[in-house]
Interface confidence: low
């Protein structure tokens, strides 16, 4: 008899990452009979939604439906029609929406309401849109990278999946940088997590993990830049701000009203004798670094050790995966190689920031000027945050791995979020038969809601 190809017994899931600067849709796929195994879920598609983050639609909520259309239609094409109805769709909004909610709960709810109504119109199994906490964002990012690196697998391998993978079961820490917040998450070495807000306990695949996590709201790269500008304009003697974080010859006019729009600049707000000011780049890495350091209050620490702003941080431990904007920025600057030391990165940043704006524009003609102009700041900010903020040193820098994808799946919180909400990370080691719902554990922490 002729061999007939059996239909693939696969499942799909969709997660929308509604970030502060943009929204991305991720489609995940996995073999149905292996959904409790570690490392079987993989990303098959990423669709970047054209336009800004959803928080920017606060005055034009009627445009949200159109905004989401292209990527949702793309999901319809990628996922076989027969599976549409059983494919879960989750939308998680992060720090951009956390900031909007701080300004007005009503406005944030209005945006989410329209998002939910738009997503409900598609033939998928829509599971809701919500603003995830910073703690969840950190935790799910940590789960994602360790799941993809095979750290939860009990089978030790004699080969490595990825170049920087150490062939042991020590988990990687997760460093996530967004536009509005940044997260640091790792398992400290025999260290008490002195602040309960920063402690998570997981039981995954039969093993207990005590995890430290913190999300610094307003310390994503875009909000950090707004903070820096608001701080520096306080001491400008007129409406010219000579800024070392922009290339020499770069000029841009900023509205003071835009500067003070975000809650992140409230602490620096003051009545200025002008409505607009002009940034004039002077391109000096060291001065830029010095200015950024002033955003980190290290003058008080109620714990044995702090990152900044009085937030507990245990001693760093093990290897770290740095993803999202940590990766995008360093990739653009060509600084993601494992061989590049921290000293070399600093030297390269000094040279890059000192390059005249006209030269930069010519060298990177294909890059949007808005993004291009901010790489000097962003690169310097990343160094400042990692070295002074999180206390990495020239030596421990070598334990930071700038990661875009692992095994074809983007590093980020979305995969971990879906794994949790679809109950695909069992608390105990999977048996040959799937376990009942009751044996699954999201995490023993009041901030986390397990979805059924």
């Amino acid at each position: 008899t002729q061999n007939k190809a059996l239909p693939e017994n696969v499942k799909y899931g969709i997660v929308l990452d509604a970030g502060s600067s943009h929204t991305s849709l991720y489609i995940y796929k996995w073999p149905a009979e292996k959904e409790n195994d570690t490392g079987v879920v993989h990303q098959v598609e990423e669709c970047r939604v054209k336009g800004p983050g959803i928080s920017k639609f606060v005055q034009k909520v009627n445009e949200i439906g159109i905004y989401l259309t292209d990527c949702m239609e793309r999901a319809r094409e990628v996922i076989p029609r027969s599976q549409h109805q059983e494919t879960p769709v989750y939308l998680g909004a992060t720090a951009g929406m956390r900031l909007l909610r701080m300004e007005s709960e009503e406005l944030a709810d209005r945006v989410l309401d329209v998002v939910e109504r738009s997503l409900s119109n598609y033939p998928f199994d829509f599971q809701g849109a919500r603003i995830i906490t910073g703690q969840e964002e950190g935790a799910y990012g940590w789960i994602t990278i360790n799941y993809l690196l095979g750290k939860f697998s009990q089978k030790t391998r004699w080969f490595s999946i990825v170049p920087y993978e150490t062939n042991n079961q020590e988990t990687f820490g997760a460093l996530d940088l967004g536009g509005a917040s940044t997260q640091v998450t790792f398992v400290p070495q025999n260290q008490t997590i002195e602040s309960p807000d920063n402690a998570l306990q997981f039981r995954l695949y039969g093993k207990d993990y005590n995890v430290y996590t913190h999300s610094f709201l307003c310390y994503g790269k875009d909000q950090a830049l707004w903070q820096k500008l608001a701080k520096d304009i306080q001491v400008a003697s007129n409406e010219i701000l000579r800024d070392p974080c922009f290339h020499p010859g770069y000029k841009k006019v900023v509205n003071v009203s835009d500067l003070y729009k975000t809650p992140c600049t409230k602490r620096f707000e003051m009545t200025l004798p002008f409505q607009q000011f002009e940034i004039q780049g002077i391109g000096n890495y060291q001065q830029c670094h010095q200015s950024i350091l002033e955003l980190f209050n290290t003058s008080y620490c109620p714990y044995s050790q702090c990152a900044f702003n009085g937030i507990f941080l245990p001693p760093l431990q093990g290897d770290f995966g740095a993803f999202s904007a940590f990766y995008f920025v360093m990739k653009f600057l060509n600084l993601t190689s494992e061989k590049v030391s921290q000293e070399k990165v600093t030297e390269m940043m000094k040279k890059f920031c000192a390059q005249p704006w006209e030269e930069i524009k010519t060298s990177y003609a294909g890059v949007k000027e808005k993004y291009l102009s901010e790489y000097c700041f962003s690169g310097t900010y990343i160094l400042s945050l990692l070295l002074q903020g999180y206390h990495f040193t020239a030596d421990s820098w070598e334990h930071i791995h700038f990661i875009g994808k692992i095994q074809g799946s983007d590093a980020g919180w979305t995969l971990g979020y879906m794994l949790n909400l679809t109950n695909m990370i069992p608390a105990e080691q999977p048996l040959s038969t799937p376990l009942s719902h009751s044996t699954y554990v999201a995490h023993h922490h009041h901030h986390h809601h397990h979805h059924h």
């Epitope: 701080k231 001491v235 620096f268 001065q287 010095q290 290290t298 003058s299 020239a394």
Partner: antibody
């Protein structure tokens, strides 16, 4: 002409309190961060505290943390150092200095005022 | 905290002589260093900022230099008004820290 004038020094008993003012003139005081620095007799300079232009950032040396408070009144162009629980080791000449990144870091200093803590 | 180790603690030199004072930082300070002069009457004056930039009004015989974590102040030809105490200060991080000082005396 930039001028910084400290005053208010004197003799104080251990455990006592004193507030030192520093009057600024000749520049836009509200644009600048300000420092207090001290020098014990026959010793080197020791940084004490810093306050940013808008008072949003404040730092202290460990030796004075919890006892000294730096503050400013931008309307009156005056910097202050409130000192409490004074000890004999706080005996020193106290200087104020202005600070504005990038080229005005501690570029002008006052002439100093003397504090003596003794019973 | 960043320690600044200044040497020598005292130095006797003659008019017209060239002298160098050094400060070593215990951690990277990326050139965030100033040099100060304190006259016998207690007056303090900044000479150099950002490790090597001369303040306006400061004679050209003063110069600042950096070599790794070592920072130096050189006076190319001593004049009588240069005999004073000299301090370095790092402004890379808080707390700000001074070198122990160098007393420059006439030989």
């Amino acid at each position: 002409e930039v001028q910084l004038v400290e005053s208010g020094g004197g003799l104080v008993k251990p455990g006592g309190s004193l507030k030192l003012p520093c009057a600024a003139s000749g520049f836009t005081f509200s644009d600048y961060g300000m420092h207090w620095v001290r020098q014990a007799p026959e010793k080197g300079l020791e940084w004490v505290a810093y306050i940013s232009s808008g008072s949003s950032i404040i730092y202290y040396a460990d030796t004075v943390k919890g006892r000294f408070t730096i503050s400013r009144d931008n309307a009156k162009n005056t910097l202050f150092l409130q000192m409490t629980s004074l000890r004999s080791e706080d005996t020193a000449m106290y200087y104020c200095a202005r600070d504005l990144y990038y080229d005005h870091v501690l570029d002008y200093w006052g002439q100093g005022t003397t504090l003596t803590v003794a019973s | 905290d960043i320690q600044m180790t200044q040497s020598p603690s005292s130095l006797s030199a003659s008019l017209g002589e060239r002298v160098s004072l050094t400060c070593r930082a215990s951690q990277e300070i990326s050139g965030y260093l100033i040099w100060l002069q304190q006259k016998p009457d207690g007056t303090i004056k900044r000479l150099i900022y950002a490790a090597s930039t001369l303040d306006s009004g400061v004679p050209k015989r003063f110069s600042g230099n950096r070599s790794g974590s070592d920072y130096s102040l050189t006076i190319s030809s001593l004049e009588s008004e240069d005999f004073a105490d000299y301090y370095c200060l790092q402004y890379a991080s808080y707390p700000r820290t001074f070198g122990g000082g160098t007393k420059l005396e006439i030989k």
